[in-house]
Structure formats: C-alpha cells, structure tokens
C-alpha cells in the first residue's frame, strides 16, 4: 500500500491534449503507472504512460487526436484515473471528474517576431497555437521584457485584456539588447491558468543617431 498525500492535476489545452501531473509522497519507485481518460459521452478513451519529472512526481500528455481538432466540448466530463501496476493487476491511485473547459492551460504563444524596431520602441507580434475557436476574442495576454542586468522575475508584467497578438514596447534604451516573452489565458474556466511563457525573442534597439536625440 502507498501512504502519504497524493495530488493529481490536469489541464486541457482546449483542442486535443490533456496534460497531467501526479505527485505522491512516499511514492513507488519502480512501478509502472499511467493516466486513463474516459469521456462520459464519447466513443473513445485514451491512455498515457506517466514518466518521472522529479523524485515524487510524474507527468504525461494524453494525445486525443490531431493537434488542431476539437476533441472535447464544454459539455464533456472526462473521468481521469491514475492506474499503477501491482503484480498482475492495476490499482487506482487517484481519480477525478474533469471538466475540460474549467481547467484550461493553452499552449505557449509561438512565432514571435519583430515587426518594427526603432531607437526607443519595438513592435512585436505573435500567434496563439492550438487554441479553440470557442474563445472567439475572449483571451488575455501577459508580456514581459528582459532588460540588461535584470532577471525575468524582476521584469514588470504588461497585461493585454483582449485578444491582441502584438505589442508596441516603448521607452526602450537605444542600442540595447532585450528579450521578450508572452503568455496567454482564456477568460473561461474556474481553474484555468496561464499558458507557459513563450520562447524568448531577442532583439536589439537601433543606435541613437549621432548629434541627435531621437
């Protein structure tokens, strides 16, 4: 028997992926475990193998179909179970009735690019990836810019309260190297959380013109 506290957290990316993390204190070391997804009103079910991410936690991705296919709706409830092998049988270690559109975490934004750069400002655009058409324009973004000599944690957060896939960064220093990241979150969902941060985009502002203050 396994003692200790167990935590089983899953998020839906709004299209065809449910990512899960299972943590177990006093966990089993050499046991094979998996997550099993059983929707209440679909003809399919899906399984993924839990792989260790730390000493007491495991993760896996339930791939429900093609990346941009709408595999679940807001009416679906999915029974998610953690099953671990005990000899010849499987034991249920954790279970939850999962409402996909109450537990959203979208994929990180992609295709970041500099649209236009000047001495003091830079216009950057990005795209959202594998996000359901359900959201229409009801998404919000957070962005941050890494300045020289600072850490990401120190970077102030810029909030975009609408589906705006670009930003104009102002009051930058000329001829300076910066990095930029953005993340996205739908308004829908009681337990919805921010996507991971995008891959950083590096850019450099233009040097100030000699003898001029631009």
């Amino acid at each position: 028997a396994v003692n200790g506290t167990s935590q089983f957290t899953c998020f839906y990316n709004s299209r065809a992926n449910i990512s899960c993390v299972w943590s177990q204190d006093g966990a089993l070391q050499d046991t094979s475990c998996q997550v099993h997804a059983w929707p209440d009103r679909r003809r399919w079910n899906q399984t993924c193998e839990l792989l260790p991410v730390s000493q007491a936690s495991w993760a896996c991705n339930l791939i429900l179909g093609a990346p941009d296919s709408q595999k679940l709706t807001t009416v679906d409830i999915v029974t998610l179970r953690v099953l671990c092998r005990e000899g010849v049988r499987w034991r249920v270690m954790a279970i939850q009735d999962f409402k996909p559109f109450e537990n959203l975490r979208l994929m990180a934004p992609i295709s970041l690019q500099v649209v236009h750069v000047e001495t003091h400002r830079c216009n950057i655009s990005w795209e959202i990836s594998q996000a359901s058409h359900y959201f229409e324009r009801h998404l919000e973004f957070e962005a941050r810019t890494l300045s020289p000599g600072h850490t990401w944690e120190e970077a102030p957060l810029l909030t975009l309260k609408q589906k705006q896939e670009w930003i104009c960064l102002e009051t930058l220093t000329p001829d300076t190297q910066y990095e930029f990241q953005v993340r996205v979150k739908p308004l829908q969902g009681e337990f919805t959380t921010w996507s991971p941060w995008s891959q950083p985009l590096a850019f450099r502002t233009k040097p100030a013109a000699l003898g001029k203050d631009t």
Epitope: S69, Q70, T73, T74, V75, F101, E102, H133, Y134, F135, E136, H138, L187, Q188, E190
Partner: antibody, heavy 117, light 107 residues
Framework: EVQLVQSGAEVKKPGATVKISCKVS????????MHWVQQAPGKGLEWMGW????????EYAPGFQDRVTITADTSTDTAYMELSSLRSEDTAVYYC??????????WGQGTTVTVSS | EIVMTQSPATLSVSPGERATLSCRAS??????LHWYQQKPGQAPRLLII???QSISGIPARFSGSRSGTEFTLTISSLQSEDFAVYYC?????????FGQGTKLEIK
C-alpha cells in the same frame, strides 16, 4: 460588420414542421458556433442547442432534443433550425446567434413562428 | 437544470440614478454568468461576461459583480436608452439557462 439575417415569419398547423434559416456575414462561419434560442410569450428565453460549423457537431438541450435538428451549410454560410411535431406552445420568436459555447455575442433579428389550427 | 432567479421582476428608477439588478443561481456556478439587455422588438444584446467582464462597445456605466451564487448588474447613471429588460444566463451546467428577466422602467 457581423450580420445574421433570419428567414421570415411562419404560420404552421399543429403536428407540422418548421425550418428557419440564418444567413451570416462578416465573420468566418467555418470557425463558428451557431446557436438557436426560443423566446415564447410567458416562458422567457430558452436555449435550444448549437452546431459547431468547424466539425458539424451538435449539442441539444434536453427539452428540445427529440424534436429539433440544427444544421449548417458552410458553402452558403447559413445555419438552419428545424422543429418538428409543432404544438401551440411552440408559438414563439426563434433567434439564431453566434458565440462561443458559453454566451451569445451576436444575434439575428428573430423569426416569429405561430402554431395554430 | 440550474434555475436562475432575477429580482426584482420590475424596477422603477429615475434617469441619472443608479439601478441594481440581482440574479441568483440555484446552485454554485462559479463565475459562469452573463448579462444581456433586450429592448422591445429587438434581439438581446450581450453586456457582461463571466460575472464582471465588460464587452467592448458597452458603456462603462454597466458593471457586474458576484458574491457566491448571487450576481449583480449595476448601471451607475441611467440613460434613457437603458430602460429595457435585462436577463442573466448561466453556462456552468448544460443546458444553459436564463433568468426570467428584470424590466427596468422609468420612474
């Protein structure tokens, strides 16, 4: 500009079937959910169901699922709602609307259906 | 099916004054509550989503709030065009359901 234009008023006999159309413009119909809502006098607003034009999936409210069929023609950007076995209490204004699954962002002008012998 | 109860059924307020409309859910619906305005002979119009998020193009005098299963729509200073019927709608449990409406009339 987003527009949803519904077909005209209908008078039907009890037991008959009515089919209402909703022609849309100003947005990508193939990436939209199209909903139908009934507003009967004294009964208020009732959600009938929706169709996801992207994949053709439908969702019907339990109170209507035996009698309603929602379809979408992506070649003409038109949604349809068919209600069968009509009875007098189906006398109402029927609205098509566009939105995510959770709320209705844009509405048609409404179609009045009168069921009378 | 979740029952949405709006109160009062009719509210009489003078132009320029504040109007407070209430909507209560029969069970917990998180923030899955949306507000619409309907004028005579017209389709409803979406005002507020998720209890408190204003829709773009809706005047700032419209605001929403939540306390448990009770939701409030506040119109801070009533204009003549605000007199209409207001509906709340839940999207927590299918089928989504509407309240019976509050008629806001000129005092």
């Amino acid at each position: 500009e987003v527009q949803l234009v519904q077909s005209g008023a209908e008078v039907k006999k009890p037991g008959a079937t009515v089919k209402i159309s909703c022609k849309v413009s100003g947005f990508n119909f193939k990436e939209s959910l199209m909903h139908w809502v009934q507003q009967a006098p004294g009964k208020g607003l009732e959600w009938m169901g929706w169709i996801d034009s992207e994949n053709g999936e439908t969702e019907y409210a339990p109170g209507f699922q035996d009698r309603v069929t929602i379809t979408a023609d992506t070649s003409t950007d038109t949604a349809y709602m068919e209600l069968s076995s009509l009875r007098s209490e189906d006398t109402a204004v029927y609205y098509c609307a566009r939105g995510g699954p959770w709320f209705l962002s844009y509405w048609g002008q409404g179609t009045t259906v009168t069921v009378s012998s | 099916e979740i029952v949405m109860t709006q109160s009062p059924a009719t509210l009489s307020v003078s132009p320029g004054e504040r109007a407070t409309l209430s909507c209560r859910a029969s069970q917990i619906i998180s923030n899955n509550l949306h507000w619409y305005q309907q004028k005579p002979g017209q389709a409803p119009r979406l005002l507020i989503i998720y209890g408190l998020q204003s829709i773009s193009g809706i005047p700032a005098r419209f605001s929403g709030s939540r306390s448990g299963t009770e939701f409030t729509l506040t119109i801070s200073s009533l204009q003549s065009e605000d007199f209409a019927v207001y509906y709340c709608q839940q999207s927590n449990n299918w089928p989504w359901t509407f309240g019976q409406g509050t008629k806001l009339e000129i005092k």
